[in-house]
């Protein structure tokens, strides 16, 4: 099942997605799409990166993180109820069927009061998932010392435990790495 993220109408939504580039200068293409990840590519692409740049985006969608270091988390600006739904982050690792696919569910709540426009990201506390691609060259993986390597089956459990807890934000800010594979 998808990990759920929440934001209020008028705020910025944040959908986390991470990987560690195997080597400097050789980024892995990533696409973000609206809708669950299909077998190949992303459906309804809203943003795409290539080996070096953000090379396609649509209005209100952008990468605010260190995307060249593997933080390809998506920011959606000034969300409306229509932005609710499943989003796909697809890390397009070379080779047949090597892609890592993450489905993230965005739930938009009506604003409690009419808020002043804010650029604050509304983080929901599900654990941000990180892919470490194992390759040659100086990968810049930062691992939080107190956090063990965990696998895919543990992620959803951990995400559920962390949901609605501030710990997830603290972990993300600490550069915690979940190794997949």
């Amino acid at each position: 099942s998808e990990v759920e993220y929440r934001a209020e109408v008028g705020q910025n939504a944040y959908l986390p997605c991470f990987y560690t580039p195997a080597a400097p200068g050789n980024l892995v293409p990533v696409c973000w799409g609206k809708g669950a990840c299909p077998v190949f590519e992303c459906g309804n692409v809203v943003l795409r990166t290539d080996e070096r740049d953000v090379n396609y985006w649509t209005s209100r969608y952008w990468l605010n993180g260190d995307f060249r270091k593997g933080d390809v988390s998506l920011t959606i600006e000034n969300v409306t109820l229509a932005d609710s739904g499943i989003y796909c982050c697809r890390i397009q690792i070379p080779g047949i069927m090597n892609d890592e696919k993450f489905n993230l569910k965005l739930v938009i709540k009506p604003a409690k009061v009419t808020p002043a426009p804010t650029r604050q990201r509304d983080f929901t506390a599900a654990f941000p998932r990180m892919l470490t691609t194992r390759g040659h060259g100086p990968a810049e993986t930062q691992t939080l010392g107190s956090l063990p390597d965990i696998n895919l089956t543990q992620i959803s459990t951990l995400a559920n435990e962390l949901r609605d807890s501030r710990l997830a934000n603290d972990l993300r800010d600490s550069g915690a790495t979940i190794r997949i594979g």
Epitope: G25, N26, D53, V54, N55, R68, G137
Partner: antibody, heavy 120, light 107 residues
């Protein structure tokens, strides 16, 4: 220390081509992108494109697409930028600049510049 | 293309005073902005990368800030050797684009 040494000044006629070289030393040539930037007299900076010597991958400014080609010679750690169908408004100083991964592909080292004058 | 607009075009500042140069992107570029200093007859020199990181060897009177669309280069106490043209550049998406430049001079 890192150095980027460019070829000498060129004077060309409209319609001709120019090929500027940039010899790199002091670092592993294939580990960094090489970008090309130009500056017309008294004007600002304009990005032409880049090449990644490791795999030959390129990206060009659409404005110059079809007129510009970037290549490298790994054996001599040299990058080349060829601009064809020259016009008078191509008169500029052309720089090669190293795109540093650890500085998020901003340009940590620049060549000294090659002046290209296009005049009939 | 993403347009980078610098202000002001020219900035006269007294020695020892603070200088502030602004750069506005036509759309969000995250933190993917660099600042360069260029003196006559020389190539540009990297001062700040990734919006706020001072490059090696750059004096600490230079600082950068901002994210998204609005960026600032600040020189806390102007020195004579800081007289130059300053450029911002976005490297979020190609074609990478530069601001038109700000000429910093002594008042």
């Amino acid at each position: 220390q890192v150095q980027l040494v460019q070829s000498g000044a060129e004077v060309k006629k409209p319609g001709a081509s120019v090929k500027v070289s940039c010899k790199a030393s002091g670092y592993t040539f294939t580990d960094y992108y090489m970008d090309w930037v130009r500056q017309a007299p008294g004007q600002g900076l304009e990005w032409l494109g880049y090449i990644y010597p490791n795999n030959g991958g390129t990206s060009y400014n659409q404005k110059f697409k079809g007129r510009v080609t970037m290549t490298t010679d790994k054996s001599t750690s040299t990058a080349y930028m060829e601009l064809r169908s020259l016009r008078s408004d191509d008169t500029a100083v052309y720089y090669c600049a190293r795109g540093g991964y650890y500085s998020y592909y901003s340009y940590d080292y620049w060549g000294q510049g090659t002046t290209v004058t296009v005049s009939s | 293309d993403i347009v980078m607009t610098q202000s002001p075009d020219s900035l006269p500042v007294s020695l020892g005073e603070r200088a502030t140069i602004n750069c506005k992107a036509s759309q969000s570029v995250g933190n993917n902005v660099a600042w360069y200093q260029q003196k006559p007859g020389q190539p540009p020199k990297l001062l700040i990368y990734y919006a706020s990181n001072r490059y090696t060897g750059v004096p600490d009177r230079f600082s950068g800030s901002g994210s998204g669309t609005d960026f600032t280069l600040t020189i806390s106490s102007l020195q004579a050797e800081d007289v130059a043209v300053y450029y911002c550049q976005q490297h979020y998406s190609s074609p990478y684009t530069f601001g038109q430049g700000t000429k910093l001079e002594i008042k």
